[in-house]
């Protein structure tokens, strides 16, 4: 057994542009409160029941009235920790949901109005008994800063709160079969403590607080003999006393579900189906009314005026579950285009785009040349996940902004000399060669290999290449 503790440090506008409007005004003063929901395991599926590890509601914070024209500051917070007690082992990995609620204190008919301001969720690994872990989560334009820890309640110790420790009865050593309790070397591991009142003759336990019955006995404390009517559904070995089959110990024996919950066996353990108004692994969290705000994500709570009456959450579109704690899988509609990966962040859908695509739904193809200017008369060519420029003569680089050295590639053949020119390059050919690149030899008889030299040019003149 132990307690999960959550300390809210601040709730206010996050960094960056688009600061949120203050949730309160002079006409509508308000105050904040927080709700935390814990589930065991790292995946949503790990906790079929809502808030299976428990839930807690903070006190209401101080009343806040916005100063006209002032930006939304960090808002005044409720005092104290949010504490979620857990009766069984701490799972080590858990999922959390923290909701920030606003209670408007204007003159509404029917009392204060509640609305959900922000909701953050996450999955974490945490060992019980460790130091406070700090966290920052953002929901839209809001930012929530908080710390959390899990601590064991004595006599439980360890990272899962499953080991029990007692002060040593003798100063030198622990009892037979019991080890010292690290790091509390002055204490000893204690034998398992079964559920209070569990029959020492007919009951036993494998977990603290449990009471499992030996053959022939039943009831929450294993004090009731099994009647012969139980022979109708045999499961265990024959009983010598009654001469019929009686159930052997099973996970639902003694009904671990509290508050009228019904128990059903699962391959590894059991599952409680809780009546309305109760939740938790064993339906042990009780007394929830609409005043406690049990409906997440803006769900509307109906009924449940007192702890004995049931409440029902009417969920807004996109949410489901008995407490509106589960989000509908909106990504299954595949809104992201061009192979983008869909992420449901709760307040919005986001698409993680493949290379070469951009936009909220990856709808923009970066390969197209729209809006991509190539300088100095270059032309844009599509392909390869990014635009490419085919540059005009004398220019180079990604956007044709760099002036190219036309002589760098040594374009003049047969020892011709290259000169850079504003419109290209000029080759001054060595004796015996001619042509734009000095590529044609001049024959000994004075005739060129060309059919004819252009008028006005003699062999050996520099050839200007346009």
């Amino acid at each position: 057994a132990g307690v999960f503790e959550l300390q809210i440090h601040s709730f206010g506008p996050g960094p960056g542009p688009g600061a949120p409007r203050s949730p309160c005004s002079a006409r509508l003063p308000c105050r904040l409160f927080f709700r935390v929901c814990l589930k065991p395991g790292l995946s949503e599926e790990a906790a079929e029941s809502p808030c299976a590890l428990g839930a807690a509601l903070s006190a209401r914070g101080p009343v806040y009235t916005e100063q006209p024209g002032a930006p939304a500051p960090d808002l005044p917070l409720p005092d104290g920790l949010l504490q979620v007690p857990f009766r069984d082992a701490w799972p080590g990995t858990f999922s959390f949901i923290i909701e920030t609620w606003r209670e408007e204190l204007g003159d509404q008919i029917g009392g204060p109005a509640w609305s959900l301001l922000a909701r953050v969720a996450g999955r974490r690994r945490l060992a019980a008994g460790g130091p406070w872990a700090r966290d920052i989560q953002r929901a839209g334009a809001w930012e929530l800063r908080f710390s959390y820890r899990a601590r064991c309640e004595p006599p439980a110790v360890g990272t899962a709160c499953t080991r029990l420790c007692r002060p040593r009865s003798a100063p030198s050593r622990c009892g037979p079969g019991l080890r010292p309790c690290a790091p509390l070397e002055d204490e000893c591991e204690a034998p398992l403590v079964c559920r209070a009142g569990c029959s020492p003759e007919h009951g036993f336990c494998e977990q603290p607080g449990e009471c499992r019955c030996l053959e022939g006995w039943t009831g929450p404390l294993c004090t009731v003999p099994v009647s012969t009517s139980s022979c109708l559904s045999p499961r265990g070995p024959s009983s010598a006393t009654t001469g019929c089959l009686v159930p052997g110990p099973g996970p639902c024996d003694g009904n671990p579900c509290a508050n009228g919950g019904s128990c059903s066996e699962t391959p590894r353990s059991f599952e409680c189906t809780c009546p309305r108004g109760f939740y938790g692994l064993r339906c042990e969290v009780s007394g929830v009314t609409c005043a406690d705000g049990p409906c997440f994500n803006g769900g509307l709570c109906v009924g449940g005026a007192d702890p004995d009456s049931a409440y029902i959450c009417h969920c807004p579109p996109g949410f489901q579950g008995s407490n509106c704690e589960k989000r509908v899988d909106r990504c299954s509609l595949q809104p992201c285009r061009n192979g983008g990966l869909c992420l449901d962040l709760g307040h919005a859908l986001r698409c993680r785009c493949r290379a070469g695509f951009a936009g909220p739904r990856c709808e923009h193809d970066l390969d197209d040349c729209a809006g991509r200017a190539c300088a100095n008369g270059g032309t844009c060519v599509e392909g390869g996940g990014a635009h490419r420029c085919s540059c005009a003569l004398g220019f180079g680089g990604r956007d044709c902004r760099e002036r190219a050295d036309p002589c760098a590639a040594r374009p003049c053949a047969h020892g011709g000399r290259c000169y850079a020119h504003f419109s290209g390059l000029v080759c001054a050919c060595a004796p015996g060669y001619m042509g734009a690149r000095c590529e044609f030899p001049v024959h000994p008889d004075g005739a060129s290999a060309l059919p004819a030299a252009p008028p006005g040019l003699r062999p050996g003149d520099p050839q200007r290449y346009l």
Partner: nanobody, 120 residues
Framework: EVQLVESGGGEVQPGGSLRLSCAAS????????MGWYRQAPGKQRELVAG???????IYAESVKGRFTISRDNAKNTVYLQMSSLRAEDTAVYYC??????????????WGQGTLVTVKP
């Protein structure tokens, strides 16, 4: 603000057919993805059929060959033709749309749902 209005639900016998319609209306918007989800009592809401952002058609495995989704772009409407209906198709059917608004932002909208009951 965009509204999605479903119609066409009702009670039908096993093997029968129904045609659901979902019309989108509101100020300037364009539809990116649109389709149908359903939620049976005590179950999670699941996608039945839809047009994806890439305009592909997708179907849940359990309805392939029996349900057909179609659309009329001019009317901003999608249809779900359901045939060979079974008892396990009984659910509230919700229209859903991922929409680009005039502001260029995208929003995901849900209809209020229409009940389909399949029983002898």
């Amino acid at each position: 603000e965009v509204q999605l209005v479903e119609s066409g639900g009702g009670e039908v016998q096993p093997g029968g057919s129904l045609r659901l319609s979902c019309a989108a209306s509101g100020f300037t918007f364009s539809i990116n993805a649109m389709g149908w989800y359903r939620q049976a009592p005590g179950k999670q809401r699941e996608l039945v059929a839809g047009f994806t952002g890439d305009t592909n058609t997708i179907y849940a495995e359990s309805v392939k060959g029996r349900f057909t989704i179609s659309r009329d772009n001019a009317k901003n409407t999608v249809y779900l033709q359901m045939s060979s209906l079974r008892a396990e198709d009984t659910a509230v059917y919700y229209c859903a749309a991922d929409v680009q608004l005039f502001s260029r932002d995208y929003e995901f909208y849900w209809g209020q749902g229409t009940l389909v009951t399949v029983k002898p």
